[in-house]
Amino acid sequence: MMTGTIETTGNISAKKGGSVILQCHLSSTMAQVTQVNWEQHDHSLLAIRNAELGWHIYPAFKDRVAPGPGLGLTLQSLTMNDTGEYFCTYHTYPDGTYRGRIFLEVLESSVAEHSARFQIP
């Protein structure tokens, strides 16, 4: 039985050229997290954090994606094309797979605030 809950940073905004932290947190389960995958809106993989072998950044994103903090992901040098959904997928044992969603809006405005709050989707 899957008892866990994924908390995410929810809907966030950041300005073009800046950076943003994508964060998910799995709670309410004793399951072992074996791997966390980060995917983009078109389901292309950004990064993997394997519990035993560590971080792997997809080659196409290695200049713009930084691992962490924690199991989160930092996107840098944001462009308007980065606007969209991001997914964290927690692979756990014995529970199985948990998935969280974050929506990132990249704003042109120089006064755009980076708003991030933890919320349950």
Epitope: N37, E39, S44, E52, L53, H56, Y58, H91, T97
Partner: antibody, heavy 121, light 108 residues
Framework: QVQLVQSGAEVKKPGASVKVSCKAS????????MHWVRQAPGQGLEWMGI????????SYARKFQGRVTMTRDTSTSTVYMELSSLRSEDTAVYYC??????????????WGQGTMVTVSS | EIVMTQSPATLSVSPGERATLSCRAS??????LAWYQQKPGQAPRLLIY???TRATGIPARFSGSGSGTEFTLTISSLQSEDFAVYYC??????????FGGGTKVEIK
């Protein structure tokens, strides 16, 4: 050219251990993951585990945890797979296979010739 | 773990004909999918990686497509040397990395 050369066939008794070697040549040994895959007679391919030759980190399939140990010797560009507490169901051909660079998990582009391990009383 | 399911288990095809092999993942593997060919008594050989990129030295009659959970390997015109067992594999979630059960392509 890039190649992986494995040690010769082994016949073992139930309860014993076997250690298979895989010597790499033709590329920078430390830069690519190495995997071990086995194939029982007439059966499909079964992944056993992976080792990062640069730093020695490993990840094993849960099925083999506690029985398998993967190590490497960077001075000879050789990886080893030791399987203990052998039983008849471990009779199989054991392959080493080169994976992607250690920055990203890739497909298995180079395979050893295979080592037949027979477990019989 | 991600379960890879291949179909059909056996495919009977005449030389010169087209062969289409399917592979389904129990959850998305993005494009991190490989196809291997194995002949009796030999080690597997990488054909396709990244779901659609041919490995070095692989003839153009082999092509791969798909992403997410549904993938296809197509052999446009079967040659005698193509009769073998074909395996798909995901390499994005581990442990364990997982293979499909294989599709045997045999002469009709």
């Amino acid at each position: 050219q890039v190649q992986l050369v494995q040690s010769g066939a082994e016949v073992k008794k139930p309860g014993a251990s076997v250690k298979v070697s895989c010597k790499a040549s033709g590329y920078t040994f430390r830069e690519y993951y190495m995997h071990w895959v086995r194939q029982a007679p007439g059966q499909g391919l079964e992944w056993m585990g992976i080792i990062n030759p640069s730093i020695g980190l490993t990840s094993y399939a849960r099925k083999f945890q506690g029985r398998v140990t993967m190590t490497r010797d960077t001075s000879t560009s050789t990886v080893y797979m030791e399987l203990s507490s052998l039983r008849s169901e471990d009779t199989a051909v054991y392959y080493c296979a080169r994976g992607g660079r250690t920055t990203w998990i890739g497909a298995f582009d180079i395979w050893g010739q295979g080592t037949m391990v027979t477990v019989s009383s | 773990e991600i379960v890879m399911t291949q179909s059909p288990a056996t495919l009977s095809v005449s030389p010169g004909e087209r062969a289409t092999l399917s592979c389904r993942a129990s959850q998305s593997v993005s494009s991190n999918l490989a196809w291997y060919q194995q002949k009796p008594g030999q080690a597997p050989r990488l054909l396709i990686y990244g779901a659609s990129t041919r490995a070095t030295g692989i003839p153009a009659r082999f092509s791969g497509s798909g992403s997410g959970t549904e993938f296809t390997l197509t052999i446009s015109s079967l040659q005698s040397e193509d009769f073998a067992v074909y395996y798909c594999q995901q390499y994005v979630v581990w442990p364990p990395l997982t293979f499909g059960g294989g599709t045997k392509v045999e002469i009709k």
